[in-house]
Interface confidence: medium
Amino acid sequence: AGVFELQIHSFGPGPGPGAPRSPCSARGPCRLFFRVCLKPGLSEEAAESPCALGAALSARGPVYTEQPEAPAPDLPLPNGLLQVPFRDAWPGTFSLIIETWREELGDQIGGPAWSLLARVTRRRRLAAGGPWARDIQRAGAWELRFSYRARCELLAVGTACTRLCRPRSAPSRCGPGLRPCAPLEDECEAPPVCRAGCSLEHGFCEQPGECRCLEGWTGPLCTVPASTSSCLGLRGPSSATTGCLVPGPGPCDGNPCANGGSCSETPGSFECTCPRGFYGLRCEVSGVTCADGPCFNGGLCVGGADPDSAYICHCPPGFQGSNCEKRVDRCSLQPCRNGGLCLDLGHALRCRCRAGFAGPRCEHNLDDCAGRACANGGTCVEGGGAHRCSCALGFGGRDCRERADPCAARPCAHGGRCYAHFSGLVCACAPGYMGSRCEFPVHPDGVSALPAAPPGLRPGDPQRYL
């Protein structure tokens, strides 16, 4: 359990031309108030997602009325801190959203009108119990200066406020400068504040304001190496006569804190104080910058010069994701038309077209008759992978441009003679046959077994192919 605290120092026009003179509209005076919203993690949260870690609203600030000739000021702010209590563990990484709202006090129907003036979003890492962190943010033409911190409450301790201690005044041998927690908790309270300047590495205290030295160090602040130690030869945690401590092997031996973190002992455990940019139990975690090469597959990294500022990867063709880590399945967009098969070759896409289609994306229909006229009265027929002309009688070839001999194929059966005619061909049938192609035999009594000849044509007369 604990509380996140936000102190707004100033809100006013940012530097540069075009900065607004007043937060108020022309309708009259206004006053400001602030809303803070906390979301866990460092992910890009949608603006409307809930403030899962909590939210708080400030009081209304003093009424502001624009002075026409006065320079644009920092605006009057609400008094006090904005406090967001948290019941569970402090997550360490969070998104901080600060909204500046304007309350217009003109003669509005239905009371004051509210409007959002500025909104800043920061993704941050912050250990509970640390010092105030200061920040300056711009939102459009406005500039906001603020400080924030997270602190533990209700006897919670640690960088996440997860360790609960109940004070106990009985003396102990918990370790340098640490007192044990209540019997139910195998943890320690925060150490007392030692004398100002007492060496962090070589001194410790069991009571506030004192500074006791580890073996090999001396002086009021334990900063002077001792040439001879009065503790030599002693074993055990302390000597009543000398006040020296001869530490046995402790959890900080070998310094488990990575990246230059400094270690302080807790009973049976340790705690790391991490340098800027590092966090985690052993200071083993840091933010990512462009120097880390976070953009894969040839992506270009932009921004992100320090761990607190974001970087962006510009991905080469064929890759996507925040770090260009995902190969784009370009075929999933189905770029090949008309049932073509898509092949992603890495450097390029290729479409394998079905018969009758062509082009980079199979977009051309080879059967398309548009613009492909058939000459001499022929008609274009689609199908078969290429346009085809059905030619009028007497013409042939791909486009019906060639003259054709209609009798070349010997169309008249049973020895009938073929005559070319302007509209086609005519068969003169041998005796005993009839029909447009002399295909029907004639009975001796002159009656056909198949449909009779049209009126006016006797069996054996030449019949024209209509």
């Epitope: 985690g280 840091s286 976070p294 894969f296 925040s322 770090n323 880590e325």
Partner: nanobody, 117 residues
Framework: QVQLKESGGGSIQAGGSLRLSCAAS????????MGWYRQAPGKGRELVSR???????YYADSVKGRFTVSQDNAKNTVSLQMNSLKPEDTAMYYC???????????WGQGTQVTVSS
Amino acid sequence: QVQLKESGGGSIQAGGSLRLSCAASGVSYNRCSMGWYRQAPGKGRELVSRIQPGGNTYYADSVKGRFTVSQDNAKNTVSLQMNSLKPEDTAMYYCNALCWRENVNYWGQGTQVTVSS
């Protein structure tokens, strides 16, 4: 919880070889990229090599052709084979996991490499 533990450092003559190994636990290889950094006394930390998802590798210009990074996902290890070592390779070498889902780097404790001429 991601934990990285380096081994294989030591002292060696110039021209010799060393193989650094990093035991990685809690690392999801499909969202983390493993790498090696080094920090010489009084200097900043520099990226030596990185093995990206899919097996692409990156090397700093100063180590190209001499160092080789490899990853064994089954054994949860990443290794750095260092050949033709030079005195300027003397540094503390750190194993690293860059995990972009959380947008953080995880670091090992480091292993010292000292190359004498």
